[in-house]
Each structure stands twice: as C-alpha cells, then as structure tokens.
C-alpha cells in the first residue's frame, strides 16, 4: 500500500540534489584556496541533517547551525554586493569585478543557488514531488529558512560601504518583503557600516529618469537613516555599458563623457 505523502504547493526537491550539492562543494573548494580545508562530505551531512526527517514547515535557523559552522568564510567586509530581484546582473558584475562578492559567491550561497529541497517528518527520504511554498504553505520551510539564515549572517558581516543592486524596472524598486528588505537591511550593523550605496539598474534603453527619487527608494533611505547608516543612490542608466566599462575601463567609450 503506497504511503500517503503530503502534497505541497511548491516544486519538489531539485533532481540529483545530494550529488549537485556535493559536486558544487568540491568545485568551489578547488577554485577557492582559502576553503580547501573544507570536507565536502561533512558539509553535505550537515546540510542533510538540517532538514531530513523534519517537518518541512517546522525548520529553524538552529537546524542550519552545523552547516553554518562548517561553511564559515571570511570575505572582505567592505566588498559586499547585495541585490534584490536582479540576481543575474549582480552575478555578472562580480564575475567581472572580482574583488566584490554577492552571497552566491560564498560557499554556502554557491551550494544552494537556484536549488529547492525538503524532507518529510519521521522519514529519511527527500521529497522530490513537492515542497512547501513560502506564501501558500508556510514560511519556515527548509529553503526559506536557509536563505534567511545565510542572508542575515552575510549582512551582519558587512562593513564600510555596502552596495546593493536594485531592479529599476519593477513597480517596487525597493520591496520591504524581499530578502534584502526584510532581512539584510535590518541586519546591517550601524557600528560597522558607514553607507549603503544603492545602484538602481535601469531597464529601458533611453531611460534617463532619476529613479533614485522613486518613493520606494525614499522609503529605503528612511529605513536606513533611522538605523544611523548613511544612504546614497546611483542610477545605472545603461547596465550593459556599465558592465562593459568595468570589464574594459580603458576602452575609449569608457573614458569620454557622453
């Protein structure tokens, strides 16, 4: 008789999840000499231990502490790039500007990027059929709690000038309900962080509006200022051109005023 299985509203665990996590860990530790000491089998065991045999709506940050400990990593605290709803461009940027880091450039972020996972209460099985959706089912699910935990720690580590890329094409350029708006903003440490520098990324080719005057940006400025952190904002009018000039700053089109 087939056992009854909880049906959740979200997609199930990414196929070949254990193999993917392990392979990513091995690749990351090979590329990053400072993380060569990491035992990837132990990392996988700690990752698995955070959600296997646990109710997928009852996961806590505490469940991820063994994994957090194994994945402890020092990135230059003044070279942190946060992002909201514009992940691809943020990652393209740090691939070019190699001394800056998004969360997904760290080991733990790299392991979990774009993956879904969950288990089942009282069984060691991974659920490949469905996992809880943050809105429709529950917020304390394995994926959401993981990102909340690593995002909080990443923000807490930041210092000096912290950069954030925001999507200027969205109706809410700054969204209080995003991970950036709900977690990272509130975990920047005012005694360490001098300024949050927001980069508003324009979508339209000839969009010369000052999106730094957007009401949601003013809301972000208010939240940040109340936390005793200075706020500044820049328009990135042509992200393609900006990336090109970061990559090839000596290019003649990058050294003459437009």
């Amino acid at each position: 008789v087939p056992r009854w299985r909880q049906q959740w509203s979200g997609p199930g665990t990414t196929k070949r999840f254990p193999e993917t996590v392990l392979a990513r860990c091995v690749k990351y530790t090979e590329i990053h000499p400072e993380m060569r000491h990491v035992d990837c089998q132990s990392v996988w065991d700690a990752f698995k231990g955070a959600f296997i045999s646990k109710h997928p709506c009852n996961i806590t940050e505490e469940d991820y502490q063994p994994l957090m400990k194994l994945g402890t990593q020092t990135v230059p605290c003044n070279k942190i790039l946060l992002w909201s709803r514009i992940k691809d461009l943020a990652h393209q940027f740090t691939q070019v500007q190699r001394d800056m880091f998004t969360l997904e450039d760290t080991l733990l972020g790299y392991l979990a990027d774009d993956l879904t996972w969950c288990g089942e209460f009282n069984t060691s099985k991974i659920n490949y059929q469905s996992c809880p959706d943050w809105r429709k089912d529950c917020s304390n699910n394995p994926v959401s709690v993981f990102w909340k935990t690593v995002s909080r720690r990443f923000a807490e580590a930041a210092c000096d000038v912290v950069h954030v890329m925001l999507n200027g094409s969205r109706s809410k350029i700054f969204d209080k309900n995003s991970t950036f708006g709900s977690v990272e903003v509130h975990n920047l440490q005012p005694e360490k962080v001098q300024t949050l520098e927001a980069w508003v990324i324009h979508g339209g080719r000839e969009d010369s509006r000052d999106l730094c005057q957007d009401p949601t940006i003013k809301e972000l400025e208010s939240i940040i200022s109340k936390r005793n952190i200075q706020f500044s904002c820049k328009n990135i009018y042509r992200p393609d051109k900006f990336l090109q000039c970061v990559k090839n700053p000596e290019d003649s089109s990058c050294t003459s005023e437009i």
């Epitope: 003044n78 070279k79 500007q97 001394d99 000038v161 001098q194 300024t195 520098e197 005057q213 200075q230 706020f231 500044s232 904002c233 820049k234 328009n235 990135i236 009018y237 042509r238 992200p239 393609d240 051109k241 900006f242 990336l243 090109q244 000039c245 970061v246 700053p249 990058c254 050294t255 003459s256 005023e257 437009i258």
Partner: antibody
C-alpha cells in the same frame, strides 16, 4: 559663485557663511562646501543637492548645518573651535554621464572666505 | 568610504621635465576621478575629470590615466606656471564625502 561671512570669531560663537550664486539654478545643480586649514589640504564638509538632500562628511555632522534659498547656500558653523580656522570654499557640483552611469566634478569655485576662530 | 590616497606629498621638477602623481582609491570608482590644481591664495581649479578628460582650457601637457582604484596625473614638458598643489577627488559618489580628496601633491618647479 561668491562666499561671504568669514571673520574673526571667538570659540563657541555660531557663524553663518553665505554662498551667493548668479546665473546658476540651484534647483538644477548641487553646491558643496569645502574647507582648507592654513597650509593643509582640501576637506569636504557637505553638499546640498539640487533636490534639497543634504550630505555631510561624518566628521562634520553636528558641527555644520547647510541650508539654501533660491540664490544662496548657507553654511552654519554651530559652535566653532580653533580647529575650524580655515578658508571656506563654495563650489558647484556638475553631474555628467559616462560608462552607463554618472559621476560629478566640482567645476566652478568661489574665491573662498577666511574664518579665524580665536579667543 | 572611498578613501583617496595621493603620492608623493611633494615632488621637484625641472622646466621641460615630467611629473607623475598617483592617486589610489580604497574601492573602485569606475573612472570617476577628478584632478584639481591650486595655486597659493587661489581656489582650486578643475583640471581633469572622468580620469582622462581635460577640462575646458587646460593645456594638453596634462594627462590623466588609470582605472578601477589606481589613477595617475602626468605633466609633460613642465612649465614654471605648473608650480602648484594638485589634488585628486573621487566623483563616483558625492554622498560619501569623508576623504574624498587626496592629501595633495606639491609640485615645485626648479
């Protein structure tokens, strides 16, 4: 661009410096205040943006207040100390576009006004 | 902050010689680097902006170069009129003002 109001004051006596502009729309340009102690380098105090936002250097917060009218940008030294003895410059900040984004330069400076704080 | 470090503090040059002044930012300023010239008793004058663009009326013997965090001002064929103090300034973020000017380089022409 012309600064005025510089004079000899005793420590603790508030002083307001005025930057008067002609032919410059303060709703279109930001104006910055920069100071230079005798024999020393340039030090940014603060800036009033065209939109009315004010940014101060961290060291200047609480010590200076910037405000503007339609043709002037004022710098108030709230409680001067001898360390505030300097020439105070007002400068226009001009935004320009390049590399897919924008930056700024200080393209027009006043002659400066000398403030001496002494008991 | 975008702390600007300028070297050397002072340099001597012979007429007709070449002077090189370096400016380093603590973080990338994406070519938004300005150079100013200041003579005694005068306000600073904009010399170069956007790392290499000459301001109006500035002679071509002044040349700006660099990118990212490292920038250079070169004066070729130095003239006695070039005796002054030169300052770099980051123009990337005008909301971050601490140490946005370099410490200055005095150029003495022999």
């Amino acid at each position: 661009v012309e600064e005025s109001g510089g004079r000899l004051v005793t420590p603790g006596t508030p002083l307001t410096l005025t930057c008067t502009v002609s032919g410059i729309d303060l709703n279109s340009y930001a104006m910055g205040w920069v100071r230079q102690a005798p024999g020393k380098g340039l030090k940014y105090i603060g800036i009033m943006t065209s939109g009315g936002n004010i940014y101060y250097a961290n060291w200047a917060k609480g010590r200076f207040t910037i405000s503007k009218t339609s043709t002037t940008v004022d710098l108030r030294i709230t409680s001067p100390t001898t360390e505030d003895t300097a020439t105070y410059f007002c400068a226009r900040e001009r935004e320009f576009y390049g590399g897919g984004t924008s930056g700024s330069r200080l393209d027009l400076w006043g002659q400066g006004t000398l403030v001496t704080v002494s008991s | 902050a975008y702390d600007m470090t300028q070297t050397p503090a002072s340099v001597e040059a012979a007429v007709g010689g070449t002077v090189t002044i370096k400016c380093q930012a603590s973080q990338s300023i994406y070519n938004f680097l300005n150079w100013y010239q200041q003579k005694p008793g005068q306000p600073p004058k904009l010399l170069i902006y956007y790392a290499s663009t000459l301001a109006f009326g500035v002679p071509s013997r002044f040349k700006g170069s660099g990118s990212g965090t490292e920038y250079t001002l070169t004066i070729s064929g130095v003239e006695s009129a070039d005796a002054a103090t030169y300052y770099c300034q980051q123009g990337w973020n005008s909301g971050i003002l601490d140490n946005s000017f370099g410490g200055g380089t005095e150029v003495v022409v022999k």
